[in-house]
């Protein structure tokens, strides 16, 4: 049962991520900012279950590339961002086995490209935004707040797809 | 579901301290800030402090930096608030709440709120 | 520490019309995107309960009768049409920057 299998992993990277907080979120109020998170590409109800789990995917993917950069090993804590990474690598693979199984039940699976690319652009404007902030403690805790969010509503997502089970 | 149990009312005298709690259920109570509001009767909500479960970490507004000290047992998911030299103006309902949306730092779960009392 | 100012104190709004309040900061609270502002409906004996978050974002499960506009210093809540359980105070309450403040309130008579 795989959206039950990383609703778990998804609680348990963000119980990490949680406590990946190094330094105080209230000394970064003025660093905050809005990445654009799009939120209506997790709306569960307009894909089917493959595009729903492709963008699930490229969440985790791109979530994962960005906690694996030299500078994410600079900021956080060592053994719980490995943690983290391996959270994340596990659902990735589950995620994959997924698209496989749904790929052979569905008639003809569309490919949600624009989808993809608005999550892609999504992270592309996080990186800008750690380049311009110089990988600055505070931006990274901006950040750790971001992908908790994205999190969630990856969350979220799984949920309404559990239902359509 | 998601629920906050603060300790009954307290009737204090002047100069004394009082200590209530703050039980969460229902969620994860180390991963989420915990907010302290106070309401003084008939009157708006003022914004006491905020502590971090997961490892202790609090701020403070400065206006209660040196009245009210928060606390957290993560073993019994309990939140503590203690107020030190009470005055007639610390008369007061004192909420909980839980963190909401990470760092927009809005409120969504309230406690009932701890009543106290402040006479001679 | 900033200063939320709102406005009417009180109002009284017939069934079905509309209800606007008003929230004042005395600085900024928008930066980059977003605006920390956020609305709580206080009914009496009850605690506070969150309605708009973000400026204009609706809290999951509050009815569409709710919105809430603006940015930097200036805010509005409206309520349209009023009906009858909306008679309650209003708080704004930002967190723009540390101390988070909350308005006087903003109490709502349903005539």
């Known amino acids: 049962d795989l959206p039950q299998t990383h609703s778990l992993g998804n609680r348990r990277a963000l119980i990490l991520l949680a406590q990946m907080g190094r330094i105080s979120p209230f000394s970064c109020l003025k660093d905050r900012h809005d990445f654009g998170l799009p939120q209506e590409e997790f709306d569960g109800n307009q894909f089917q279950k493959t595009q729903a789990i492709s963008v699930l995917h490229e969440m985790i993917q791109q979530t994962f590339n960005l906690f694996s950069t030299e500078d994410s090993s600079a900021a956080w804590e060592q053994s719980l961002l490995e943690k983290f990474s391996t959270e994340l690598y596990q659902q990735l693979n589950n995620l994959e086995a997924c698209v496989i199984q749904e790929v052979g039940m569905e008639e003809t699976p569309l490919m949600n490209e624009d989808s993809i690319l608005a999550v892609r652009k999504y992270f592309q404007r996080i990186t800008l935004y750690l380049t311009e902030k110089k990988y600055s403690p505070c931006a990274w805790e901006v950040v750790r707040a971001e992908i908790m969010r994205s999190l969630s509503f990856s969350t979220n997502l799984q949920k309404r797809l559990r239902r359509k089970d | 579901q998601v629920q906050l149990q603060e300790s009954g009312t307290v009737l204090a005298r002047p100069g004394a301290s009082v200590k209530m709690s703050c039980k969460a259920s229902?969620?994860?109570?180390?991963?989420?800030?915990m907010h302290w509001v106070k309401q003084r009767p008939g009157q708006g909500l003022e914004w006491i402090g905020v502590?971090?479960?997961?490892?202790?970490?609090?701020t403070y507004n400065q206006k209660f930096k040196d009245k009210a000290k928060l606390t957290a047992v993560t073993s019994a998911n309990t939140a503590y608030m203690e107020l030190s030299s009470l005055t007639n103006e610390d008369s007061a309902v004192y909420f909980c709440t839980r963190n909401y949306k990470y760092d927009y730092y809005t409120m969504d779960y309230w406690g009932q709120g701890t009543t106290v009392t402040v006479s001679s | 520490d900033i200063v939320l100012t709102q406005s009417p104190a009180s109002l009284a709004v017939s069934l079905g019309q509309r209800a606007t309040i008003s929230c004042r900061a005395s600085?900024?609270?928008?930066?980059?995107?977003?605006?920390?502002m956020h609305w709580y409906q206080q009914k009496p004996g009850q605690t506070p309960k969150l309605l708009i978050y973000l400026a204009s974002n609706l809290e999951s499960g509050v009815p569409a009768r709710f919105s809430g506009s603006g940015s930097g210093t200036d805010f509005t809540l409206n309520i349209h049409p009023v009906e009858e359980e909306d008679a309650a105070t209003y708080y704004c309450q930002h967190s723009g920057e540390l101390p988070f403040t909350f308005g006087s309130g903003t109490k709502l008579e349903i005539k």
């Open positions: 600085k900024s609270v928008s930066t980059s995107g977003h605006s920390y």
């Open positions: 502590i971090y479960p997961g490892n202790g970490d609090t």
């Open positions: 229902g969620y994860s109570f180390t991963t989420y800030w």
